[in-house]
Interface confidence: medium
Amino acid sequence: SLYVPCAPSPCVNGGTCRQTGDFTFECNCLPGFEGSTCERNIDDCPNHRCQNGGVCVDGVNTYNCRCPPQWTGQFCTEDVDECLLQPNACQNGGTCANRNGGYGCVCVNGWSGDDCSE
């Protein structure tokens, strides 16, 4: 039987096949893929902008930042307001004070410790 390079197409991940000779083909890959048959997802993480300890997670022609608990946003640059998230973060009447990358408690009436529980 006659071999036709692009029938069926060897290109994967949405790549488009183009016959370049009697027995040869070329795959035109969609953005984010590479390889002779578009089989590889290009790692976008070498170019990441994740901040504040955020971890880059590769996607297709993009990436996402997995942020530590204290940070949020596309690049982990927005401070999480722990005082809003945890209304009882400070015990015994202590006042919660949000800070960049964390929070602190201002204790009253002789209480002490990170959460005014001592």
Epitope: I42, P46, N47, H48, R49, C56, N61, T62, G73, Q74
Partner: antibody, heavy 117, light 110 residues
Framework: SLEESGGDLVKPGASLTLTCTAS?????????MCWVRQAPGKGLEWIAC????????TYYASWAKGRFTISKSSSTTVTLQMTSLTVADTATYFC???????????WGPGTLVTVSS | DVVMTQTPASVEAAVGGTVTIKCQAS??????LAWYQQKPGQPPKLLIY???KLASGVPSRFSGRGSGTQFTLTISDLECADAATYYC????????????FGGGTKVEIK
């Protein structure tokens, strides 16, 4: 399109601010606004970039740190402040929009800065 | 900063011929490399991005290859209009690699 302005003839030691104005688009996430210069008859030299998103990350060539400052002054303008200019800073200064993800780069025509006594 | 070393500084070739320009990065830049064409009195024009992706409107006679530290730009079926200076450029952010250009290669057509 992009257009640079502010190029001038100045004396050594002077300061100068260049402005890059975008037409037809406003700054948003996904690309950088950059400054590149080219001395007469010489090659291209990268100066600095600022991320167009709200985070405004800035990146500088090591030789440019301290003497050059890139900033976004509005959603359509980027400035480059230059201090302590020397004769070696004489060049055409280009503003460019860069992205590595889809190749949609855009350059202005350039503005000439001449430093001479 | 990453240092981009481009060779040769100049090359002469005939119409219909092929030219290959090499670019070496001082550290791995993955595939974050662009190639530009510049003619006198004009800003640079993007030809290739991500080492091998053809920019919009650029003829397929231009092709880019490589990753890591070694890259090439090949121009085949040379035309008179290809006479220009060509630059490679790293364009990554993760390790502050941004922006470094090679010294340029002047292509002259015989």
């Amino acid at each position: 399109s992009l257009e640079e302005s502010g190029g001038d003839l100045v004396k050594p030691g002077a300061s100068l601010t260049l402005t890059c104005t975008a037409s037809g688009f406003s700054f948003s996430s996904g690309y950088d606004m950059c400054w590149v210069r080219q001395a007469p008859g010489k090659g291209l030299e990268w100066i600095a970039c600022i991320y167009a998103g709200s985070e405004g990350f800035t990146y500088y060539a090591s030789w440019a740190k301290g003497r050059f400052t890139i900033s976004k002054s509005s959603s359509t303008t980027v400035t480059l402040q230059m201090t302590s200019l020397t004769v070696a800073d004489t060049a055409t200064y280009f503003c460019a929009r860069w992205t590595d993800s889809d190749g949609s780069n855009l350059w202005g025509p350039g503005t000439l800065v001449t430093v001479s006594s | 900063d990453v240092v981009m070393t481009q060779t040769p500084a100049s090359v002469e070739a005939a119409v219909g011929g092929t030219v290959t320009i090499k670019c070496q990065a001082s550290q791995s830049i993955s595939s974050y490399l662009a190639w530009y064409q510049q003619k006198p009195g004009q800003p640079p024009k993007l030809l290739i991005y991500r080492a091998s992706k053809l920019a919009s409107g650029v003829p397929s006679r231009f092709s880019g290859r490589g990753s890591g530290t070694q890259f090439t730009l090949t121009i085949s079926d040379l035309e008179c209009a290809d006479a220009a200076t060509y630059y490679c450029q790293s364009n990554s952010y993760g390790n502050n690699w941004v922006g470094g250009f090679g010294g340029g290669t002047k292509v002259e057509i015989k």
